[in-house]
């Protein structure tokens, strides 16, 4: 996961945008990546950041916990 | 409507610091980002570093090798830019400037003079 | 960091004709086919205003003489016809990416 978080990071080269694109990374069980993208006011890099980054994040933690479930863990 | 309103003019010896503050007005101050800019008499741009308020995050220009703080006052929706270790080529117009969309500087403040002299 | 390499350095025009700017960055400021490129008009005493964002919109109450053009690296600002109120200094702008630079300025006067 934060491989390939580093990975789509790495081509915003403004902080802030950056930035936005690891928080979408967090964990959040309540709220859709677009629900919390909806609260983001300073531009649509960072909504653009923040969604690529939280549905990438959101995939691979959900492919991590099928495989983990398959494997009887 | 929209305002970025800069402190006054200010002397200073060389080795000390200064303080510019920018307070904002006619927005949502923790929306946008807050960059400062200096041009030095007869000179061009030179962009110094921002502080996207919200949350705090901070960028600086390396040129200044940590002399450069950048803060913001959400309470008063003012931003301020502090130079330390000041030289006689610090003598510059500062001025503050919000970036919109994270693209382009659309309103700046009127400049605050600083000079530095012995 | 991004260059920004302004020409001329400074021009002299007639009222009624062109002016025409030009503004080379080192490295592409194109990032998914969006020009992170910015125009500036800086009149003596006053703070820069902005003419021109993403290479070519023309920000609301700036008159239609100016225009702007470009992508990837090369980069125009066109004044067409020029009036004697356009005697400024022009500058270029990118915000791809921190740090954020700007040219070196045009000094555009008015014969």
């Known amino acids: 996961l934060q491989e390939k978080i580093e990975e789509i990071a790495a081509k915003y080269k403004h902080l802030v945008v950056k930035k936005c694109c690891y928080d979408g990374v967090r964990i959040n069980h309540d709220e859709t990546c677009e629900q919390r993208a909806a609260r983001i006011s300073v531009g649509p890099r960072c909504v653009k950041a923040f969604t690529e980054c939280c549905v990438v994040a959101s995939q691979l933690r959900a492919n991590n916990s099928h495989k983990d479930l398959q494997l009887g863990r | 409507q929209v305002q970025l309103v800069q402190s006054g003019a200010e002397v200073k010896k060389p080795g000390s610091s200064v303080k510019v503050s920018c307070k904002a007005s006619?927005?949502?101050?923790?929306?946008?980002?807050i960059h400062w800019m200096r041009q030095a008499p007869g000179q061009g741009l030179e962009w110094m570093g921002y502080i996207y308020p919200r949350e705090g995050w901070t960028n600086y220009n390396e040129n200044f090798k940590g002399r450069v703080t950048i803060t913001a006052d959400k309470s008063t929706s003012t931003a301020y830019m502090e130079l330390s270790s000041l030289r006689s080529e610090d003598t510059a117009v500062y001025y503050c400037a919000r970036e919109r969309n994270l693209e382009y500087f659309d309103y700046w403040g009127q400049g605050t003079t600083v000079t530095v002299s012995s | 960091d991004i260059v920004l390499t302004q020409s001329p350095a400074s021009l002299a025009v007639s009222p009624g004709q062109r002016a025409t700017i030009t503004c080379k960055a080192s490295?592409?400021?194109?990032?998914?086919?969006?020009?992170?490129m910015n125009w500036y008009q800086q009149k003596p005493g006053q703070p820069p205003k902005l003419l021109i964002y993403a290479a070519s919109n023309l920000d609301s109450g700036v008159p239609a003489r100016f225009s702007g053009s470009g992508s990837g690296t090369d980069f125009t600002l066109t004044i067409n016809p020029v009036e004697a109120e356009d005697t400024a200094n022009y500058y270029c702008?990118?915000?791809?990416?921190?740090?954020?630079?700007f040219g070196g300025g045009t000094k555009v006067e008015i014969k």
């Open positions: 006619g927005y949502t101050f923790t929306d946008h980002i």
């Open positions: 490295q592409s400021v194109d990032f998914e086919g969006f020009n992170y």
């Open positions: 702008q990118q915000s791809l990416e921190d740090p954020h630079t």
